[in-house]
Amino acid sequence: AWELTILHTNDVHSRLEQTSEDSSKCVNASRCMGGVARLFTKVQQIRRAEPNVLLLDAGDQYQGTIWFTVYKGAEVAHFMNALRYDAMALGNHEFDNGVEGLIEPLLKEAKFPILSANIKAKGPLASQISGLYLPYKVLPVGDEVVGIVGYTSKETPFLSNPGTNLVFEDEITALQPEVDKLKTLNVNKIIALGHSGFEMDKLIAQKVRGVDVVVGGHSNTFLYTGNPPSKEVPAGKYPFIVTSDDGRKVPVVQAYAFGKYLGYLKIEFDERGNVISSHGNPILLNSSIPEDPSIKADINKWRIKLDNYSTQELGKTIVYLDGSSQSCRFRECNMGNLICDAMINNNLRHTDEMFWNHVSMCILNGGGIRSPIDERNNGTITWENLAAVLPFGGTFDLVQLKGSTLKKAFEHSVHRYGQSTGEFLQVGGIHVVYDLSRKPGDRVVKLDVLCTKCRVPSYDPLKMDEVYKVILPNFLANGGDGFQMIKDELLRHDSGDQDINVVSTYISKMKVIYPAVEGRIKFSTGSH
């Protein structure tokens, strides 16, 4: 028998520095977690102790903090090289800055192979990107070789900016021939490494003949066997075992997100490459693991540029940006409109001639807007200003909801109106009218939404049975502020870009902004 240790990360999302337990900015260092310096300590410890070790990343290193905003992926290549990753799969967020923003900082600079079997380049891009990412890699480990096949969410064109010269094929259809090639090469130990979410990971384990292990990402899935060490609630045991269609037991793993855990899976193979046993658990990278001094010093060196960046002007406002709780928790506020407009702008994807855009709606809990921005400072808006407005380090995500769920959400928005509570919704692409004289749960008297399947966008009444795409904070997608109906009833959830980054990009693009209060949210006569 031959034993392989798979160390894995996914959805690190720019958390190069240690973070608090909830993966936001580290405040009390003695209680902070993750970060590449701490990760390196643990990886090196395992490499020294065990003979056959692979360090893999399942995508979405890009996007999430000011590190990515400033360094645009160069930081990913640099620190992943320093940690000596063996391979990485492309995630959807790797395309956030377009194909060029992937090629130059990461594909050309990474010292490790970057994989995806289901992304096919065409046109002029084909020759430019040739060899910079691969469908599979044969990695020599000890006296054996291990095949790694990569995959990426086929939803990427709706979630990011891959452009028109990359085709995202069905994962299973694309993976099978590559696995067959590896088998032809007498590579009999094969890992599928990719970024399509836990449901697809399980399908790959079930359907792709010859895959021995699946290491996934995208859905931030936390798996654990035994008592979990932190706040995350396991979605199943680690590894999660799937019985394949040809009767094999295939371990599937994921390691939550944000570099908080290091996935640790030990696999025992027989001489024919069959999995005999698999066991392990994610390792919580808490403060009991010291940060590696040399990596930490490098982080501190790179940090300097971030501090300079946060005070630079992004753009100007010529109006007061009202982000006060007195406004945003009670009525339409222009800060809410600005943020929602930025959220929609960030999700412009012309992927179908029938649709002017794939999504037109935004909802945003007023309680998530934490500060106004005064225009009387020469109109200057900085990253620092935006960090005061959006201090939680969240993301603006894409969900699919039925109209009936949206209706419930808007009822929840005003179910206890008047108490300055955070659930009051700011909107974009939505016109809502409330009648507060009616009983809670029946206060939405009009709810019109902007069409997407139209050449001239207009507002139409919400249809209860129709499925709509909506951009919202991850906080709401996870049921925050009492929006349990969103969490329970959402049909799809894809995590998006860092909230501050979305707004800062929009302001930089617009240069001068002047958001108004324009009647998106109204109260019917006599009730307010």
């Epitope: 044969v138 020599p140 090469l185």
Partner: antibody
Framework: QVQLQQSGAEVKKPGASVKVSCKAS????????IYWVRQRPGQGLEWIGW????????KYNEKFKGRATLTADTSASTAYMELSSLTSEDTAVYYC????????????WGQGTLVTVSS | DIQLTQSPSFLSASVGDRVTITCKAS??????VAWYQQKPGQSPKLLIY???TRHTGVPDRFSGSGSGTEFTLTISSLQPEDFATYYC?????????FGQGTKVEIK
């Protein structure tokens, strides 16, 4: 563009060793295997082995095991092939090569290094 | 070791001719076969890999087929620059091996 530049011709005595270098450019050296192949005068091609500069693992043709040593210097993006206990049978052009997809054919070749073993 | 036997060893042909070279493996190699062209004093050049996939920049008059033990390289219309020696190679089992070569000469 991908280029593999090999060291110059060598004349060696029987029993000696030779070390041929192969400097890679135009791609990330650590991400691709380097293969070594030789061609004796007027003969066909013979695979010697490979090295993966990403972790320095090697694989040899049994025929050359113990005599051939493949190494790499990642800081210089250079691979080396050393052959010891030379005999006249080792007189050949030695090539380094790189693939597009692992193992699947040698897509890029060095210009070759002629090693002559003669007393 | 897997033996690869090419036939013919020598082939005389004219410009415009359709030329077929075969490569037989002593045991099955699925589709793990590559074809190379080599001109005197030059390094070999990859034409085909995975038995039938043309390498970037290789003219479409070159095609490969076969699987298991029998493989074919076809040049649909021989051009003056195609006169060279052609080798097949298997990369299914160690040690990787080459055929003895087929020299295509001008008639």
């Amino acid at each position: 563009q991908v280029q593999l530049q090999q060291s110059g011709a060598e004349v060696k005595k029987p029993g000696a060793s030779v070390k041929v270098s192969c400097k890679a450019s135009g791609y990330t050296f650590t991400r691709y295997y380097i293969y070594w192949v030789r061609q004796r005068p007027g003969q066909g091609l013979e695979w010697i082995g490979w090295i993966y500069p990403g972790n320095f693992n090697t694989k040899y043709n049994e025929k050359f095991k113990g005599r051939a040593t493949l190494t790499a210097d990642t800081s210089a993006s250079t691979a080396y092939m050393e052959l010891s206990s030379l005999t006249s049978e080792d007189t050949a052009v030695y090539y380094c090569a790189r693939d597009v997809y692992d193992y699947a054919g040698f897509a890029y070749w060095g210009q070759g290094t002629l090693v002559t073993v003669s007393s | 070791d897997i033996q690869l036997t090419q036939s013919p060893s020598f082939l005389s042909a004219s410009v415009g001719d359709r030329v077929t070279i075969t490569c037989k493996a002593s045991q099955g190699v699925a589709t793990a076969v590559a074809w190379y062209q080599q001109k005197p004093g030059q390094s070999p050049k990859l034409l085909i890999y995975w038995a039938s996939t043309r390498h970037t920049g290789v003219p479409d008059r070159f095609s490969g087929s076969g699987s298991g033990t029998e493989f074919t390289l076809t040049i649909s219309s021989l051009q003056p620059e195609d006169f060279a020696t052609y080798y097949c190679q298997q990369y299914s089992s160690y040690p990787w091996t080459f055929g003895q070569g087929t020299k295509v000469e001008i008639k």
